[in-house]
Interface confidence: low
C-alpha cells in the first residue's frame, strides 16, 4: 500500500474539516496494480452529524456511528477501497467499549481487518484517519514492519501480512 505521508484520511472524532483543509492523500496502489486517487472529502461526506446519523440498510448503529460487517474476504487494501467506495472507512476502534461492541457482533472467530496498518514512512502503527494507535488502550501482537496490517480476533489486535484475505468491517 503506497500512501503519501502514510496518512490515508483526515477525518477526526466524527467531525469533518472545512473543505479548504482537505488534502489529497495520494495514490493508493491496489493489489491488481490499478491506481486510484483518493480525496479525504470522500471519507468525510457522511460524518458531519454523528449523533443523529441514520445508518443504511444492513448497517448497525452504535454511539452515533454505523458499522457494516462483511461476509466475504479480501486483502487489507481491497477492503480499504471497498469501504471508501461506500463513503465509509475501515474500522477505527476508539476504546474498549467499542471493541466490546465489535466482538459482540462478530459471528465468527476468524481474523477481521480493521483500519490500522504499519506505515514504513512513519515507522509506526497508524489508523486510516492518520492518528497513531494509543498504546495505553491497545497493543498489537506480532511484527511491526512494512506490509503489516492489523486484524482483530477475540478482542486482540494482531499484525498480519496485508495481502492476507480476511473479512473486514466498514464504519462511518
Amino acid at each position: 500500500l503506497l500512501v503519501s505521508q502514510g496518512v490515508l484520511l483526515k477525518c477526526q472524532k466524527g467531525s469533518c474539516s472545512n473543505a479548504t483543509q482537505y488534502e489529497d492523500t495520494g495514490d493508493l496502489k491496489v493489489n491488481n496494480g490499478t491506481r486510484r486517487n483518493i480525496s479525504n472529502k470522500d471519507l468525510c461526506a457522511s460524518r458531519s452529524a454523528d449523533q443523529t446519523v441514520l445508518c443504511q440498510s444492513e448497517w448497525l448503529k452504535y454511539q452515533g456511528k454505523c458499522y457494516w460487517f462483511s461476509n466475504e474476504m479480501k486483502s487489507w487494501s481491497d477492503s480499504y477501497v471497498y469501504c471508501l467506495e461506500r463513503k465509509s472507512h475501515l474500522l477505527i476502534i476508539h476504546d474498549q467499549l467499542e471493541m466490546a461492541f465489535i466482538q459482540k457482533n462478530l459471528r465468527q472467530l476468524n481474523y477481521v481487518w480493521i483500519g490500522l496498518n504499519f506505515t514504513s514512512l512513519k515507522m509506526t502503527w497508524t489508523w486510516v484517519d492518520g492518528s497513531p494507535i494509543d498504546s495505553k488502550i491497545f497493543f498489537i501482537k506480532g511484527p511491526a514492519k512494512e506490509n503489516s496490517c492489523a486484524a482483530i480476533k477475540e478482542s486482540k489486535i494482531f499484525s498480519e501480512t496485508c495481502s492476507s484475505v480476511f473479512k473486514w468491517i466498514c464504519q462511518y
Partner: antibody, heavy 114, light 110 residues
Framework: SVEESGGRLVTPGTPLTLTCTVS????????MSWVRQAPGKGLEYIGI?????DTSYATWAKGRFTISKTSTTVDLEITSPTTEDTATYFC??????????????WGQGTLVTV | DYDMTQTPASVEVAVGGTVTINCQAS??????LAWYQQKPGQPPKLLIY???DLASGVPSRFKGSGSGKQFTLTISGVECADAATYYC????????????FGGGTEVVVK
C-alpha cells in the same frame, strides 16, 4: 541496552526494589518484562509493563510484586520477600515496539538472596 | 490458562547430529511462540520468534516450526557451542498465566 541493579541479601519480609535502567530506546514505545530464575531452575515470568504504563502479572505474582516505571527505568518491588524469592532477576525488552510476544534484549540479571 | 510443556527435559546429541525439542501449549496460541537459548551465567538469548522466524544473528541450523498447540525446535549439524538449556515461551496471552515459559530442555553435546 538494559541493566538491572538493586539485588542484595535481604531478610524475609523486608521490601526490596530492583531497578532496570535502559538506554538506546524509549520506554514510551517498548513493553518491558521481569523474569526470574532460581538457582538451578528454569525461567519464571513475573510480569510486564506496557509502553503506556499498564501492568500485568503472572497469577502467582499478583500482590507479591509491583512493576512501575519512569522515563528511563523500570522498577520491580518485591513487597514481602520470602526465601522462595531467592533468584536472579532479569529485565527484558520486547522485540517489537508497542507490542509484546518475544523478549529480544535482556540484562545480565541481578541476584537477590533472601 | 496457557501452560507450556516442554519435552524432553534433557537430551544428548553427538556433534554433527540433529536434536529436536518439543513444546506443547495447553490452548492454541496461533504462532505466538519464541525459543531461547541460555548458557550458564548468561541471560537467555532469543533464537526464534513467531514460531519460525529466525532472530538476527542466529545460525540457520536452528529451525522453528509448528502452530496452534504443537511446536518444535530443531537444531541440525549440532556444534559444541549449542550445548545449553533451551526454553519455549508463549507470546499470546499475558493474563491469567502461571508462566509464559516451558520448563526447559538441557542439550548435552558429546
Amino acid at each position: 541496552s538494559v541493566e538491572e541493579s538493586g539485588g542484595r541479601l535481604v531478610t524475609p519480609g523486608t521490601p526490596l526494589t530492583l531497578t532496570c535502567t535502559v538506554s538506546g530506546f524509549s520506554l514510551s514505545t517498548y513493553w518491558m518484562s521481569w523474569v526470574r530464575q532460581a538457582p538451578g531452575k528454569g525461567l519464571e515470568y513475573i510480569g510486564i509493563i506496557s509502553s503506556g504504563g499498564d501492568t500485568s502479572y503472572a497469577t502467582w505474582a499478583k500482590g507479591r510484586f509491583t512493576i512501575s516505571k519512569t522515563s528511563t527505568t523500570v522498577d520491580l518491588e518485591i513487597t514481602s520477600p520470602t526465601t522462595e524469592d531467592t533468584a536472579t532477576y532479569f529485565c527484558a525488552r520486547d522485540r517489537n515496539s508497542n507490542s509484546w510476544g518475544s523478549f529480544y534484549l535482556w540484562g545480565q540479571g541481578t541476584l537477590v538472596t533472601v | 490458562d496457557y501452560d507450556m510443556t516442554q519435552t524432553p527435559a534433557s537430551v544428548e546429541v553427538a556433534v554433527g547430529g540433529t536434536v529436536t525439542i518439543n513444546c506443547q501449549a495447553s490452548q492454541s496460541i496461533n504462532s505466538w511462540l519464541a525459543w531461547y537459548q541460555q548458557k550458564p551465567g548468561q541471560p537467555p538469548k532469543l533464537l526464534i520468534y513467531d514460531a519460525s522466524d529466525l532472530a538476527s544473528g542466529v545460525p540457520s541450523r536452528f529451525k522453528g516450526s509448528g502452530s496452534g498447540k504443537q511446536f518444535t525446535l530443531t537444531i541440525s549439524g549440532v556444534e559444541c557451542a549449542d550445548a545449553a538449556t533451551y526454553y519455549c515461551q508463549q507470546g499470546y496471552s499475558d493474563s491469567d498465566v502461571e508462566n509464559l515459559f516451558g520448563g526447559g530442555t538441557e542439550v548435552v553435546v558429546k
